[in-house]
Amino acid sequence: SEVEYRAEVGQNAYLPCFYTPAAPGNLVPVCWGKGACPVFECGNVVLRTDERDVNYWTSRYWLNGDFRKGDVSLTIENVTLADSGIYCCRIQIPGIMNDEKFNLKLVIKPAKVTPAPTRQRDFTAAFPRMLTTRGHGPAETQTLGSLPDINLTQISTLANELRDSRLANDLRDSGATIRIG
């Protein structure tokens, strides 16, 4: 079954996928596709890497992590409701039927409508809580809704962990990780 990730309309969505190269520089081709992973390749390819670089992508899809270290997590820019669905991350390990396939479900929620604040209104109630992470670019934030399902008792722990490291690394276990070699 797919791991579920959420984002709001207008946000950037983040779909984690990782592998560990056998040695530095030994990159494995990866494809991302819209739709569940088929037997071979990716259907409806939105982004592809080879042994050297990112060699194909479509508008709004990009890799914001260090793909040369195996972080091939997908960023989808400025999502709309139409971006909801299953995405396939396929680590194309050389050899017959060696590929690792991961299906990730993206759920897009309508943007929260925040009424004009009235006097004496509690400020925090008007805005979704946000966790800001370093290393994601200028003023990029990720709302709790974009994270895999977590309960509220985990939030303070998660916030502390996020303080000094990238969101992608802290969420590695809830994404797709494979060791190569």
């Epitope: 530095p24 520089g25 050297r52 670089d53 990009w62 992590g65 260090d66 040369r68 270290k69 290393g135």
Partner: antibody, heavy 121, light 107 residues
Amino acid sequence: QVQLVQSGAEVKKPGASVKVSCKASGYTFTDYYMNWVRQAPGQGLEWIGDIIPNNGGSKYNQKFKDRVTMTTDTSTSTAYMELRSLRSDDTAVYYCATWGYGSSYRWFDYWGQGTLVTVSS
Amino acid sequence: DIQMTQSPSSLSASVGDRVTITCLASQPIGIWLAWYQQKPGKSPKLLIYAATSLADGVPSRFSGSGSGTDFTFTISSLQPEDIATYYCQQLYSSPWTFGGGTKVEIK
């Protein structure tokens, strides 16, 4: 220590070819892509292409694809870049450069001293 | 090809000044931006890779930031030996492309 030593300056006539060499030492030659970059007088840097010595796989900038050939000789740890059908606007300093993650994921980046190629009738 | 737009093309600052150069990619390149320093008659020297990582042996007054399409290179306190031309380069998708360069001079 890592060194990339390039061949000497060349003067060529329009239409001729030039072959620049780059001898590597101080690292495992086959582990890293060898890039070729050029710089016309007073201008910026332009990537020509690269080659991975372990299997000879190369990737060229579309702009040079029909005129350039990159090769390597692993026995001497030397890379070569040949540019054909030279024009006056090919006058530039040509650099070999190697970069990428090395052991323990330390970034590896070294450049040759450059080879001036002058194309003039 | 991904275009890299670097600004300003030249600047003049005093010793000790904070100097900032920006580089804008025509499409997102994640973290894959490098910054080089080149002095006249010399080969380029890597200062920053992967947008924010300082290359070995590079003084800590040099730093980089950004991700996606917008990147910044900063010299926190300009020194006389920093007079050079600085280039950004994307390493996300080949052909690897460079910015047009920024010539830094002392006032």
